[in-house]
Each structure stands twice: as structure tokens, then as C-alpha cells.
């Protein structure tokens, strides 16, 4: 069963101080109707203490007295049952402590009841387990500000419990959020307490509030969505990758090329090879061979794995990535050592060969054909 966490959350405060969450189950305070109840907020160094009941701010009234770290309820009634919280606000953070109040006629002697599950739903006047809504997993709700690139998927969550099971509805900027408010609509998974929007666009920006309610109460939580518009750019390759590698004859090696590209990238792994005993064509450009490329039949094109290598596999390996805007290339060297020589760690440098000036390859007869490089374009 999830631990209880932050109960009330109605405003968007991206700059708020960190909050500490209570991990253990809340303590249970039991009282008979008409009795008085006094509870001390068990938090240290509290500058300011605020109280909530079932997620709603609790202020003093003719039966509720709030003095310092003490809460007093005079002449308790079953309606006072519920999940209470006191929050201590300090200069650097805030901390919340939770406890249950159960006002019922059916107070046992205590000998025959195991109270370890005391945080379960309280017993109301009619004997049924009833519970106002409460958050069951605030960890999934901590990130309130979502800055997301356009075309991405966004998921907002409000995991909650209560009895009867609460309903969940969503507001956008304080108003009912309807399917027709966005192209493609949105998905709500009630069992996961989530709202999902696919392919977000700038018009999706705004505040999204989940309202979780049953007949015993209502709680809400607000997220802010900012949609970052994409600026088209050629692929970006992570610096230092692929990295130089060394292995012994018969060993395995893997080159990795990490690609960042908003537009669909096309990845090629290219190696320098010899043709008719020569590494260069008549025009002085090197012979190259495509070892692997992205596509339907190629899994994980960002990784080039070489198995059972021979000395002939030594040399320079180029990761070439292109999209409709442009391209980028980085390369690494493979050193193949004789069996008896243990491989040392290569200095990891990324080569930038000068001759890669214009990446327009002449290779139209298959993946493993050898071809000459035609003016290969190189981008720093």
C-alpha cells in the first residue's frame, strides 16, 4: 500500500522550497463522540505551522483550537474523522506530518485488535469504510513544471485513493478540459490516474489541474506545461564518441555513436578499405565501405559491434549521421593487437579527417559495396 504523502496541493509554485515527505503510515488517534482530542504536531523547529484535514485548510472555529504546535478538537463528532496534516514551514524547506483521527462509538478495549493497519480507511457512523480523497504517491507529482519539446508526449499524474473510489477530472487554465480543445484530443487512464497528450504543440501550453473528488471531499493538483518549439538543425553527435578502442585478435569490440536530432536521422557506419591493393581511388579519395546503416532491418544503428576481429579489421571507423537539414561525422580508430598482447586503454580522441568534405557517396549497388568518397562534407 502506498505511503501517505502530500495531501493538499492547489497552487503552482515552481520556486517553492523542497518538501520532506513522511514515509511511514500515519498514527491513528481514536476518540468517542463528545470527547475532546488534543494532538501535538511532531515536527521540530517549526517557524510556522499550518493544518489541513482531508486536504482542506483547517482554521480555528468554535470547536477547533489551534495553539502553537497543538490541535484541540472539543466535543468530537464522527465528521471530525479523517486524514490530518500539519506542515512546518521553515526558511529553507517545509515538512509535513500526517495522522488519522477516528471518532467512533466502536472503540475496542485494544486487546483483541491489531492496530498496525490503523492508517486504513476510517470507520464512519454507518459502519462502512469511508474516506475522503488522498494522494497515494506524491513522488510522481513532484515535478510541477514540464518544459517539453514540441511533438513529444506529456503525461500528468495524480495517483489518489479514497472510498468510494474518487473520480478524476482535468481542467486547463481553470476551465473544463475537453477533447476538442486540442487536435488529436488526449487520453485519460483512470486506473493510472493519468492524463496523456501526444505530439504537443505550442497551443498546449498552460496550467493543467486534476480534481479528484468523492462525496467526502475534493483535492487538486496543478501542473504547468511549457512547449518548447524545435529549431531545425543538423544532427549533433556526442563529443568523444565513437571512442578509440583496442582489442586482441579474436576479441569483440563495440563502437557507440550517440545522436541528437529532432528530425529523423539516418546513421551509417563506414570503414576505410582497400580495393585492388589500394586505399585510394584514381581521384585520390579513399575507398569506403558501409558496414551498417539505420533502417527497418537494422536494430540499434547507434552501435556498431564487431565480433571475432582480425588484424584486417583495424583502422578508422566513421559514424556518419544525416537528416534533411544536414549531416555530421565523427570517427574512431580500432587497434587490433596480437593474441599475447593485452589491450591497453586507448586515448579517447575523436578524429576529424580533412578529406570528409562533402558526403555524397557513390554506392548504389548494396549495403556492403565498396565505393569512393565523393566530396564529403565535414562539420565541426
Amino acid at each position: 500500500r502506498p505511503s501517505f504523502s502530500l495531501v493538499e496541493d492547489t497552487t503552482l509554485e515552481p520556486e517553492e522550497p523542497p518538501t520532506k515527505y513522511q514515509i511511514s503510515q500515519p498514527e491513528v488517534y481514536v476518540a468517542a463522540p463528545g470527547e475532546s482530542l488534543e494532538v501535538r504536531c511532531l515536527l521540530k523547529d517549526a517557524a510556522v505551522i499550518s493544518w489541513t484535514k482531508d486536504g482542506v485548510h483547517l482554521g480555528p472555529n468554535n470547536r477547533t483550537v489551534l495553539i502553537g504546535e497543538y490541535l484541540q478538537i472539543k466535543g468530537a463528532t464522527p465528521r471530525d474523522s479523517g486524514l490530518y496534516a500539519c506542515t512546518a514551514t521553515r526558511t529553507v524547506d517545509s515538512e509535513t506530518w500526517y495522522f488519522m483521527v477516528n471518532v467512533t462509538d466502536a472503540i475496542s478495549s485494544g486487546d483483541d485488535e491489531d492496530d498496525t493497519d490503523g492508517a486504513e480507511d476510517f470507520v464512519s457512523e454507518n459502519g462502512n469504510n469511508k474516506r475522503a480523497p488522498y494522494w497515494t504517491n506524491t513522488e510522481k507529482m513532484e515535478k510541477r513544471l514540464h518544459a517539453v519539446p514540441a511533438a513529444n508526449t506529456v503525461k500528468f499524474r495524480c495517483p489518489a485513493g479514497g472510498n468510494p473510489t474518487p473520480t478524476m477530472r482535468w481542467l486547463k487554465n481553470g476551465k473544463e478540459f475537453k477533447q476538442e480543445h486540442r487536435i488529436g484530443g488526449y487520453k485519460v487512464r483512470n486506473q493510472h490516474w493519468s492524463l496523456i497528450m501526444e505530439s504537443v504543440v505550442p497551443s498546449d501550453k498552460g496550467n493543467y489541474t486534476c480534481v479528484v473528488e468523492n462525496e467526502y471531499g475534493s483535492i487538486n493538483h496543478t501542473y504547468h506545461l511549457d512547449v518548447v518549439e524545435r529549431s531545425p538543425h543538423r544532427p549533433i553527435l556526442q563529443a568523444g564518441l565513437p571512442a578509440n578502442a583496442s582489442t586482441v585478435v579474436g576479441g569483440d569490440v563495440e563502437f557507440v555513436c550517440k545522436v541528437y536530432s529532432d528530425a529523423q536521422p539516418h546513421i551509417q557506419w563506414i570503414k576505410h578499405v582497400e580495393k585492388n591493393g589500394s586505399k585510394y581511388g584514381p581521384d585520390g579519395l579513399p575507398y569506403l565501405k558501409v558496414l551498417k546503416h539505420s533502417g527497418i532491418n537494422s536494430s540499434n544503428a547507434e552501435v556498431l559491434a564487431l565480433f571475432n576481429v582480425t588484424e584486417a579489421d583495424a583502422g578508422e571507423y566513421i559514424c556518419k549521421v544525416s537528416n534533411y537539414i544536414g549531416q555530421a561525422n565523427q570517427s574512431a580508430w580500432l587497434t587490433v593487437l596480437p593474441k599475447q598482447q593485452a589491450p591497453g586503454r586507448e586515448k579517447e580522441i575523436t578524429a576529424s579527417p580533412d578529406y570528409l568534405e562533402k558526403l555524397e557517396f557513390r554506392h548504389d549497388s548494396g549495403l556492403n559495396d565498396i565505393f569512393e568518397a565523393q566530396k564529403i562534407e565535414w562539420h565541426e
Epitope: P2, T136, N137, K140, K143, V148, P149, N152, T153, K155, P159, K187, V188, R189, N190, Q191, H192, W193, I196, E198
Partner: antibody, heavy 119, light 107 residues
Amino acid sequence: QVQLLESGGGLVQPGGSLRLSCAASGFTFSDYAMSWVRQAPGKGLEWVSVIEGDGSYTHYADSVKGRFTISRDNSKNTLYLQMNSLRAEDTAVYYCAREKTYSSAFDYWGQGTLVTVSS
Amino acid sequence: DIQMTQSPSSLSASVGDRVTITCRASQDISSDLNWYQQKPGKAPKLLIYDASNLQSGVPSRFSGSGSGTDFTLTISSLQPEDFAVYYCQQHYSPSHTFGQGTKVEIK
């Protein structure tokens, strides 16, 4: 204990239809979302479709959208997958799987039923 | 759809080795990532859910970490019964895509 048992697989011609069933036992069926996941021979896993416990939510992989329909009969503890306009690339072992509460992790799987689409 | 990329696609290891498999999402998926193990002719088995939670009954040598786009499955000390194919799966978007799998073979 939790058990999921698929049936209804077999050989079908391209363009044909097939209905898969998944009989569930050992848990309160209506409390759980259920999914279909398939695996083509020698290939990886591909998620196909999901349906919420009360049937109020369904979703499909792009590859089957408009051709497959997921449904459930909670009174019979049974999950279904109606497959129409079948193609050769739909050939796979089809698994039904139960989703964990609060998480779309598949904690229980059936043994799978093989669907072969061939002329 | 969100793409999931696993690496390596296969690896050879010995009993007792520490094995690490990585999974990368094409966008931020928070911690909505699960790991499965599959042996030939069998249905997959859930190992880790929500990036780092060990499924009940799974040995503690399996662990998961990561959030956002980069995730890791670690087997601290490989056992004979661990030779299998491992898959990651995202459940952030409505389409719960799987990675292409990593085959762990005996060296």
C-alpha cells in the same frame, strides 16, 4: 494463483480474420487493465493493445490500428482480440498480459498462442 | 511513438560476471520503464518496474536505475539461469513500446 490462458490462434490466409481469447483466473479480473503483446518468430516483443479494467479505455499500436479490436467480458473473466484484414507481418505468438495496479508493467503473462498468416 | 534503443544487442559473459544493459528513450519518459527477461519458448517475466522497483520473487542480483531517457539493468553476479534475452519497455506514452532486446550468452 493467477493464470492466463490464450486460445484461438491458428493458420489464416492474408485478409482473413481471427479472434483470440484469454481466460483469466486467480484474481479479480475487472480490477486490472489487460494488454496483448506479440512476438514474431525470432524477433522481439511488440506491444499490440491495452484495455482498462472497466473497458472504458483502449489503445492500439499504429501497426494494428483500424484492423484489431480489443475487448473484455468481465462476467466471463475473458479478454479478446478481434483481428481483421490480417497480413503476413501479423504472424506471431500472441500473449495476453496483466498490468500491475498503478503501473503499466506486465506482471503475469499467458503461455501464448501462435497466429500464422500465410496463403 | 517513443522509440526505445537497447545496447548492446548481444553480449557474452561468464557466470559471476557483472552485466550491465542500457536502454535509451527517444524522449523523457520519467521513470516509466520496465525490464523483462525471456527464455526460449517461454513468456517474458517481469524483473523491474518503474525503473528501479524489484518485482516480487525476483532475485536481488537484478537491479534497475535511471530516469528521463537513460536507464540501466544490472545483474551483479551472473548465474547460469540468467542467460536469456532482456527487454526494456516504456509505459509513458499510450503505446507501450519495447526495446529490441539484448541477448546474454555464455562466454
